[in-house]
Each structure stands twice: as structure tokens, then as C-alpha cells.
Interface confidence: low
């Protein structure tokens, strides 16, 4: 942290004789500069130079060869790197007076005669005398106005709207300023700034429109920053709305946008009379042409349980707005004939959500579903296959005799989705088959017994078990199972000898 620069002469203020020369020296631990009352055009007789010395400090000298009333004012020495537009200069000050019997008041620019008052705030009428000893009075149409005076600043007070004149007497001679006009403007201590972009996504050739509105404030400076600024692409407009309250609406229009106009559009409002600043930003994207992106939140193969309620949600990003439709097996989905509904909702400017809802899933709801999104520039689709999962059930369990050989085949037909597995079990002691422990799983590698499975279609399967010879009555169980459930049926196989005895009997 650098300590403040120092000034020689080491005084707060100094009175300099008219037409004489004076110099101010500034010493600092880093490079220093001077700020002084005149503008650069008026300062031909002000010279600033750097001076070498052995102290190790940086020294900058300000020299005035012939002092005039215009040189009256505040001289500030500051470190170069500390100067910012927003902040008041931080440095060391000295106020110089150059009394001139013919010039009672320091000359001002025309804008200084316009005094803006915010509501009932105090204001300064900046008539400054060239001599600190000169008595000054303030007048308006009603006479002398009581207000505190400081020769470095002017009259400070709460003023009503209208013209004011400063009057001074120097060596018996009366001097008057031209009128200072006091205007009252609506201004708040905080800036209420709102930005609006009806669209943030555009195509080439379209016109970008962004607005910023300032509420209850007339003392505002608003600046736009945007990608096409350097090319002067933007057309700015200000609309003042007085009713029901004060509102300044700034509009930036960028016609015939191109991809290069994509980026941040920023409005920065600054209150002209206070160091209050507010910024708002919106990101605009310009696309060469329209687009569609489909983002499903599910896979290309989905399963639904029988009678289940299920929603399939697809997120769509598109510009211009898309038309969204659903197909089943490449045919338009006719919703009123099924317990399937679809809807589309707009979530954000270019984001849409389409939902396919199965109310109570049925077997016939299985199939390929396609969402199609299209606009004038693009068409995109997404297809997924839906399988309705059905618990396994046994359709048929029959046996088939092989005549005199004594062999028998049992066929078990089952259906379900996913395709059921078929398992065979056998109970050899017919009297004990009510007891689950009497049943054993039929292994594939048992001699004299052959098991095989054939799938008939996507949801039907047939299992066969062939017994080379059935010598005594046995029970055979077919067990069909899938993820959703299992079913079993049993069949009694009678040995051919027993069967013939029964037939004879």
C-alpha cells in the first residue's frame, strides 16, 4: 500500500498573484500525475515535467508561467494506476486562488449553468470566486436566497426549480453571473433496471431486438455493449414514458443478424448525478438456419409391465417452433382409439417436452414408436421399441404315446413376454406327489429322457420331454416362468402295461 503523494508547497490552499508564475511539486513512491482546473485546450500555459532527484521518489512538477482567474481551482496529485472513471481521484490536493479585480467568478462552461436537483436533494450552484475574501450573495426572482457559501465550491442548499444569479462586489465594482438554471429530475438512490429480450435465439437474416428499461429515474446514462457494436450494427432508441410513472425504455435493434451477432448483449445504466451503476446481460444466439435436437430420457428398447401406467418423455430443442407428432409402427397414432395419449408443452423459449402416456399397458401396445419433430428447416425423429411384459402362462400340456415301444412325449406350450423358460419336474412315487419333496428337477443329461425347447414366435414357447420307456405311473410337471411370474401344470403318465390292463378292465 503506497502512502499518499506529497505536494510542495505543503498547504491546503494558496493565493497566487495575477500574471505571476507558480509551480507545484508532487513527490510519490510511484509515477504521479496532476489533475488541474482547466481543460487541455485552455492549458497552453501549464507545463508538466518530471524531475530527477536523489531521494528515490518520483517527482512531477506543474508550472504555470502567467496565472489568470481561470487557473483558480483544485490541483490534485495522484498515482497513475489509481485513476478510474468511477471513483473520485484519491491523492493530495491544493486549492489555488488567482484573484482578478476584473474577473470575480471563475469562468465556467455552458453545461455548468445547468444544475440538476434530484427530488428534494441538496445541490451546488457552482459560482466560485477567484478571491477567497470576496463576499457573494445568491439571488432568484424573489430576492436573496439564504444558502451556505464555500468559495471552493459555490452555494450549497436545497433549491426550488428556476433561475439563480450569483452576485459579488470587488473593490466597489458589482459582478453578476449569467443565470444558473435549476431543474428537478426524478432520481432514486438505487437503479431499477430491467432487461427484456422477447427472443434469445434467432436465425440469420432476422432482426435482434433487446430492451432495457429504467424505472423512476430521469438522470440516467445507458450504454450498450454487444458483438456488432464495433461495426455499428445496432440501432438504439430511447422512449420516455411518464404515465403512470417515469420509465425510460432503451431499445437496441440489430437488423439482418448473422452468426457473428451471437454473444452477450449488455446494458449498463449509470445515474448521471450519483456513482450508482447497474448492469444487465442476455446471451443471444444466431443460427445459420433453423435446427431441431431430440433428446429422449429413455432408451431405444423400453419395457412396460402389463396394465402399468408409463410416461415416455422426449425433450426437444428447436427453432423455429416445431410441429411434433407421434407414430406407431410408422402410422399416425390415433389417440381416441387407444389408451395412449400424447402432449407437447413448451418449457422454455426453444425447449419443448413431448410426452407419450400409456394409461394401462396392453399386449397390443408393443411396437415401434416414433416421435417426429419438424420445422421449416429441419426434420428429426427418434424411434424406440416398446415391449409389453406379460407374466408367463401355460396354454397347453399334453402327452403323446409312442405305441408299443412304451415311449411317451409330453408337450408344454407357454406364452409370456419376455419368453418364458420351461423347466420339467418329475414325481416317481405317484402316491407321494402331494409332497413337494417328492418332485425332482429333470436334468438334461439323464439317459432315456430327452428335453427340448422350441420358440414358436416372440411370445410363445413349446417344451418337450420324451421318455424312452415309462414302466410305472409317474407325474410330470411343466413349470413356465419369466421375470413377471410363473405357472405350472401337472400330468400323469401311465405305463403302457397298466394302460392296457385298464382298457381290458
Amino acid at each position: 500500500q503506497l502512502s499518499l503523494p506529497s505536494i510542495l508547497p505543503n498547504e491546503n490552499e494558496k493565493v497566487v498573484q495575477l500574471n505571476s508564475s507558480f509551480s507545484l511539486r508532487c513527490f510519490g513512491e510511484s509515477e504521479v500525475s496532476w489533475q488541474y482546473p482547466m481543460s487541455e485546450e485552455e492549458s497552453s500555459d501549464v507545463e508538466i515535467r518530471n524531475e530527477e532527484n536523489n531521494s528515490g521518489l518520483f517527482v512531477t512538477v506543474l508550472e504555470v508561467s502567467s496565472a489568470s482567474a481561470a487557473h483558480t481551482g483544485l490541483y490534485t496529485c495522484y498515482y497513475n494506476h489509481t485513476q478510474t472513471e468511477e471513483n473520485e481521484l484519491e491523492g493530495r490536493h491544493i486549492y489555488i486562488y488567482v484573484p482578478d479585480p476584473d474577473v470575480a467568478f471563475v469562468p465556467l462552461g455552458m453545461t455548468d449553468y445547468l444544475v440538476i436537483v434530484e427530488d428534494d436533494d441538496s445541490a451546488i450552484i457552482p459560482c466560485r470566486t477567484t478571491d477567497p475574501e470576496t463576499p457573494v450573495t445568491l439571488h432568484n426572482s424573489e430576492g436573496v436566497v439564504p444558502a451556505s457559501y464555500d468559495s471552493r465550491q459555490g452555494f450549497n442548499g436545497t433549491f426550488t426549480v428556476g433561475p439563480y444569479i450569483c452576485e459579488a462586489t470587488v473593490k466597489g465594482k458589482k459582478f453578476q453571473t449569467i443565470p444558473f438554471n435549476v431543474y428537478a429530475l426524478k432520481a432514486t438512490s438505487e437503479l431499477d433496471l430491467e432487461m427484456e429480450a422477447l427472443k434469445t435465439v434467432y436465425k440469420s437474416g432476422e432482426t435482434i431486438v433487446v430492451t432495457c428499461a429504467v424505472f423512476n429515474n430521469e438522470v440516467v446514462d445507458l450504454q450498450w455493449t454487444y458483438p456488432g457494436e464495433v461495426k455499428g450494427k445496432g440501432i438504439t432508441m430511447l422512449e420516455e414514458i411518464k404515465v403512470p410513472s417515469i420509465k425510460l425504455v432503451y431499445t437496441l435493434t440489430v437488423p439482418e443478424a448473422t452468426v457473428k451477432d451471437s454473444g452477450d448483449y449488455e446494458c449498463a445504466a449509470r445515474q448521471a448525478t450519483r456513482e450508482v451503476k447497474e448492469m444487465k446481460k442476455v446471451t443471444i444466439s444466431v443460427h445459420e438456419k433453423g435446427f431441431i435436437e431430440i433428446k429422449p430420457t429413455f432408451s431405444q428398447l423400453e419395457a412396460v409391465n402389463l396394465h402399468e401406467v408409463k410416461h415416455f418423455v422426449v425433450e426437444v430443442r428447436a427453432y423455429p417452433p416445431p410441429r411434433i407428432s407421434w407414430l406407431k409402427n410408422n402410422l399416425t397414432l390415433i389417440e381416441n382409439l387407444t389408451e395412449i395419449t400424447t402432449d407437447v408443452e413448451k418449457i422454455q423459449e426453444i425447449r419443448y417436452r413431448s410426452k407419450l402416456k400409456l394409461i394401462r399397458a396392453k399386449e397390443e401396445d408393443s411396437g415401434h414408436y416414433t416421435i417426429v419433430a419438424q420445422n421449416e428447416d429441419a426434420v428429426k425423429s427418434y424411434t424406440f421399441e416398446l415391449l409389453t411384459q406379460v407374466p408367463s402362462s401355460i396354454l397347453d400340456l399334453v402327452d403323446d404315446h409312442h405305441g408299443s415301444t412304451g415311449g411317451q412325449t409330453v408337450r408344454c406350450t407357454a406364452e409370456g413376454t419376455p419368453l418364458p423358460d420351461i423347466e420339467w419336474m418329475i414325481c416317481k412315487d405317484i402316491k407321494k406327489c402331494n409332497n413337494e419333496t417328492s418332485w425332482t428337477i429333470l436334468a438334461n443329461n439323464v439317459s432315456n429322457i430327452i428335453t427340448e425347447i422350441h420358440s414358436r414366435d416372440r411370445s410363445t414357447v413349446e417344451g418337450r420331454v420324451t421318455f424312452a420307456k415309462v414302466e410305472e405311473t409317474i407325474a410330470v410337471r411343466c413349470l413356465a416362468k419369466n421375470l413377471l411370474g410363473a405357472e405350472n401344470r401337472e400330468l400323469k403318465l401311465v405305463a403302457p402295461t397298466l394302460r392296457s390292463e385298464l382298457t381290458v378292465a
Epitope: 430420457t297 429413455f298 410416461h311 408443452e345 418449457i347
Partner: antibody, heavy 120, light 108 residues
Framework: QVQLVESGGGLVKPGGSLRLSCAAS????????MNWIRQAPGKGLEWVSF????????YYADSVKGRFTISRDNAKNSLYLQMNSLRAEDTAVYYC?????????????WGQGTTVTVSS | DIQMTQSPSSLSASVGDRVTITCRAS??????INWYQQKPGKAPKLLIY???SLQGGVPSRFSGSGSGTDFTLAISSLQPEDFATYYC??????????FGQGTRLEIK
């Protein structure tokens, strides 16, 4: 901004009742499914109950079935949980949570929670 | 009911590390899994939905993957604010909606 605020928690004796409320703001409440989730001290998250946007579909966890009742008043942007026959094991922080409009139904907005203590 | 088993139940790591948390479901399904982060005394926050979709406003160092029975939450480069408890949740088969038991991520 989108917000859920629970209230109604407190200390209650076993067998007693409490009614929790959840006030929603910043979004169209009637468009969203809602849930109650609880978290016992030092434990993980446990789903308690679900209600569809219109209130036509309601689910409960087995642990609260028959004792808790979920309801909603879309006109008042409010979700409720009536808790009867409270037990010590119902002691927890209770959160209301919004189901996101996404297939996976992630709970994208949560309240800050309200504490229920069941103790004699 | 579908059970969700998270592993590990706790994990120590350093800032900048890559960490992964796994969630195993007792039944196979596609995508219907969400991941949450919870800090002490706070409500859970949705990080990932539909197994791999990043919730708005969540840093891109978080990612989700997996299908079937095994799902993973990854944090590519741990930041100090990532130390918390993480939960997986399934909404494939409801009711009930079930959560994993949680993974506590601590600073090493």
C-alpha cells in the same frame, strides 16, 4: 424463485397426531407431482408418500400406510401430510420435494425440512 | 421392491481427485436412476437425473453413467464444496421410490 417451505413439525407423544404443510411458490404447483421424504437422525433418506398433480394417484411407504394421509390444495399451492398414530420411529426431518418433469422423475426442488419428534 | 445398494458407504479423498460412487440395483432397468448431494443440515440437491443427464446449474465435473443393475456417479476433479453425502434413487418401480443408503465423501 422456485421454493418449497415446510411447517407443522414439533414434539408429539406416541399415538399422537401432527399435520405437516408445504407451501409452494415460484412455479405452477398444479403441474407437478409431489412427495414427502423423511430422514431420521443420522440416517439416510426414506420416501414416505407421493401424490399426483391432481391428487388422483397416491402412494405410501409400507411403514406409514394406514397412519399417514397425503393431500394437496392446488388453489392454495399447498401440500399436506396428516400423521396419526405416531411412533418413536417416525422421528425425523420431513422434506417435501417436487418431482421434475422428466422421465426419471428426479426430485428437483426440495424444502428446507421440518423436524418431527415423537417421544414420551 | 427394488433395493439400491451403494458402495462404498464412506470414502476419503483429496481436492483434485477423481472419485466414483457405485449404486447396484436389485433388479435391472434402464435409466430410471437419480443422484443427489446432501450437506449437513441441508436438503438434498438433485445432481443427475435419468442416469446420465446433468441437472441445470450443476457443475460439469459431475457425471452419471450405467444401466441394467450398475450405475455410477463420477466427480472428475473434487472441489472443497463437493465433500458431502451422496444418494442414488430409483424411480423405475414405484411405489416405493427407494434410495441407496448413502455414501459419505470426506476430506482425506
Amino acid at each position: 424463485q422456485v421454493q418449497l417451505v415446510e411447517s407443522g413439525g414439533g414434539l408429539v407423544k406416541p399415538g399422537g397426531s401432527l399435520r405437516l404443510s408445504c407451501a409452494a411458490s415460484g412455479f405452477t404447483f398444479s403441474d407437478y407431482y409431489m412427495n414427502w421424504i423423511r430422514q431420521a437422525p443420522g440416517k439416510g433418506l426414506e420416501w414416505v408418500s407421493f401424490i399426483s398433480s391432481s391428487g388422483s394417484t397416491i402412494y405410501y411407504a409400507d411403514s406409514v400406510k394406514g397412519r399417514f394421509t397425503i393431500s394437496r390444495d392446488n388453489a392454495k399451492n399447498s401440500l399436506y401430510l396428516q400423521m396419526n398414530s405416531l411412533r418413536a420411529e417416525d422421528t425425523a426431518v420431513y422434506y417435501c420435494a417436487r418431482d421434475g418433469h422428466i422421465a426419471a422423475r428426479g426430485m428437483d426442488v426440495w424444502g428446507q425440512g421440518t423436524t418431527v419428534t415423537v417421544s414420551s | 421392491d427394488i433395493q439400491m445398494t451403494q458402495s462404498p458407504s464412506s470414502l476419503s479423498a483429496s481436492v483434485g481427485d477423481r472419485v466414483t460412487i457405485t449404486c447396484r440395483a436389485s433388479q435391472s432397468f434402464s435409466r430410471y436412476i437419480n443422484w443427489y448431494q446432501q450437506k449437513p443440515g441441508k436438503a438434498p440437491k438433485l445432481l443427475i437425473y435419468a442416469a446420465s443427464s446433468l441437472q441445470g446449474g450443476v457443475p460439469s465435473r459431475f457425471s452419471g453413467s450405467g444401466s441394467g443393475t450398475d450405475f455410477t456417479l463420477a466427480i472428475s476433479s473434487l472441489q472443497p464444496e463437493d465433500f458431502a453425502t451422496y444418494y442414488c434413487q430409483q424411480t423405475y418401480s414405484t411405489p416405493p421410490i427407494t434410495f441407496g443408503q448413502g455414501t459419505r465423501l470426506e476430506i482425506k
